[in-house]
Interface confidence: medium
């Protein structure tokens, strides 16, 4: 029997192919075999099928990087990494996606899910769309909705100062942040660390964070697979 999706365009299609173990998979943008991309798939959280695009866990990877690095992506997909804005833009252009953020710290955990998530193209400076919050972490991403991405060498925020420079990270900064998941690992100084404001505030750097996405209609697709 052939695969349901010979060239899966995301982790949800990989899962619908029968792959149910979290790990590295190859996906194909728009199902095009010439646009292969290695991603880490979370196949367990809330039904699985998630492409993980950010992970912070130990501070070994440097996240204070320039525009070029954030556009392309960096790090080890099994460890700390950033998948890349170009990749995020292409993936979210394939259809309607949802965002999940998982946070953990000293045995505590929290999550945030946004029903509608997209990242614009390079021309928009990777403008963020994030709407429809639910979860336990608090709606901190709402503040960043509609913002373009900022790095220390490309300042697109609405502050007089350069937010990325001030807080040694990169994000869809406004003036400046409620979320700073690419901040300085372990830095509990105000607004400098790995922050999710409505969970742990700005003076606490969270130990573990993942951002991930999957199609908004995943549950419908999953149900269809089970019936089949």
């Amino acid at each position: 029997i052939g695969l349901l999706y010979p060239f899966p365009r995301d982790c949800s299609q990989a899962m619908l192919n029968g792959d149910t173990t979290s790990g590295l998979y190859t996906i194909y943008i728009n199902g095009d075999k010439t646009q292969a991309l290695e991603v880490y798939c979370d196949m367990t959280s809330d039904g699985g099928g998630w492409i993980v695009f950010l992970r912070r866990k130990n501070g070994r990877e440097d996240f204070y990087r320039n525009w070029k690095a954030y556009a392309a992506g960096f790090g080890d997909r099994r460890e700390e990494f950033w998948l890349g804005l170009d990749n995020l833009s292409k993936i979210t252009a394939q259809g309607q996606y949802e965002l999940r953020v998982d946070l953990q710290d000293h045995g505590e955990s929290a999550y945030a899910v946004y029903d509608r998530f997209s990242v614009g193209d390079a021309k928009s400076r990777y403008k963020l769309k994030v709407e429809g919050y639910s979860g336990t972490a608090g709606d901190s991403m709402n503040y960043h909705n509609g913002r373009s991405f900022s790095t220390y060498d490309k300042d697109t925020d609405s502050a007089i100062t350069n937010c990325a420079l001030s807080y040694k990270g990169a994000f869809w900064y406004k003036n400046c942040h409620r979320v700073n998941l690419m901040g300085r690992y372990g830095d509990n100084n105000h607004s400098q660390g790995v922050n999710w404001f409505h969970w742990k505030g700005h003076e606490y750097s969270i130990q573990f964070a993942e951002m991930k996405l999957r199609p908004s209609n995943f549950r419908n697709l999953e149900g269809r697979r089970k019936r089949a």
Epitope: D139, Y143, A159, R178, S191
Partner: antibody, heavy 120, light 107 residues
């Protein structure tokens, strides 16, 4: 154009209740958090309460917590403030204000206000 | 709660002069600071949001600056229609709190 119109104010005795309403028009109501801000005669501004666009999250100043309840009816583009156990110090002009993002908010549109006087 | 302290409380100023109003937060608030103008008998009006961004339709003689705990509202050349009370407000966290106001009147 974007407009907020408050109603429901008046003279009320201490311990009694009052319900304020705010009718919104000119914007997609359920996309925005909404708030109540008050101003006692001759005094400054005091934030009273806020509610998220969906109505799922509500926030209150300590001075009104347990006595006031904010709610909204997105189908009617309306915001409400149910005020119970009113005190003399609740006497103020109550403004309805549109937020720009949610909790910890900026108020970009204000109504003209409705006066609440608590006196025996 | 975050306390917002404005100074001065009153500022008699001639038309055409430069006006500077300061606002200090009791704790660090990044740039989550807004400025409002209120004229007698009227509702407040948003002038500046996020410390330095001019609200649509507000004249360019108004500007805002600052971050962290110290902020400033500047009117480069005071016009007759600018006589009003000005309030700062932190939008960093709930409860959102306002300064006590600065009344700019005719000297």
């Amino acid at each position: 154009q974007v407009q907020l119109v408050e109603s429901g104010g008046g003279l009320v005795q201490p311990g009694r209740s009052l319900r304020l309403s705010c009718a919104a028009s000119g914007f997609t109501f359920d996309d925005y958090a909404m708030h109540w801000v008050r101003q006692a005669p001759g005094k400054g501004l005091e934030w009273v309460s806020g509610i998220s666009g969906s109505g799922g999250s509500t926030y209150y100043a300590d001075s009104v917590k347990g006595r006031f309840t904010i709610s909204r009816d997105n189908a009617k583009n309306s915001l409400y403030l149910q005020m119970n156990s009113l005190r003399a110090e609740d006497t103020a002009l109550y403004y309805c204000a549109k937020g720009t993002r949610g909790e910890g908010d900026t108020f970009d549109i204000w109504g003209q206000g409705t006066m609440v006087t608590v006196s025996s | 709660d975050i306390q917002m302290t404005q100074s001065p409380a009153s500022l008699p100023t001639p038309v055409g002069d430069r006006v500077t109003i300061t606002c200090r937060a009791s704790q660090y608030i990044q740039g989550f600071l807004n400025w409002y103008q209120q004229k007698p008998g009227k509702a407040p009006k948003l002038l500046i949001y996020d410390a330095s961004n001019l609200e649509t339709g507000v004249p360019s003689r108004f500007s805002g600056s600052g971050s962290g705990t110290d902020f400033t509202l500047t009117i480069s050349s005071l016009q007759p229609e600018d006589f009003a009370t000005y309030y700062c407000q932190q939008s960093y966290s709930t409860p959102q709190t306002f300064g006590q106001g600065t009344k700019v009147d005719i000297k």
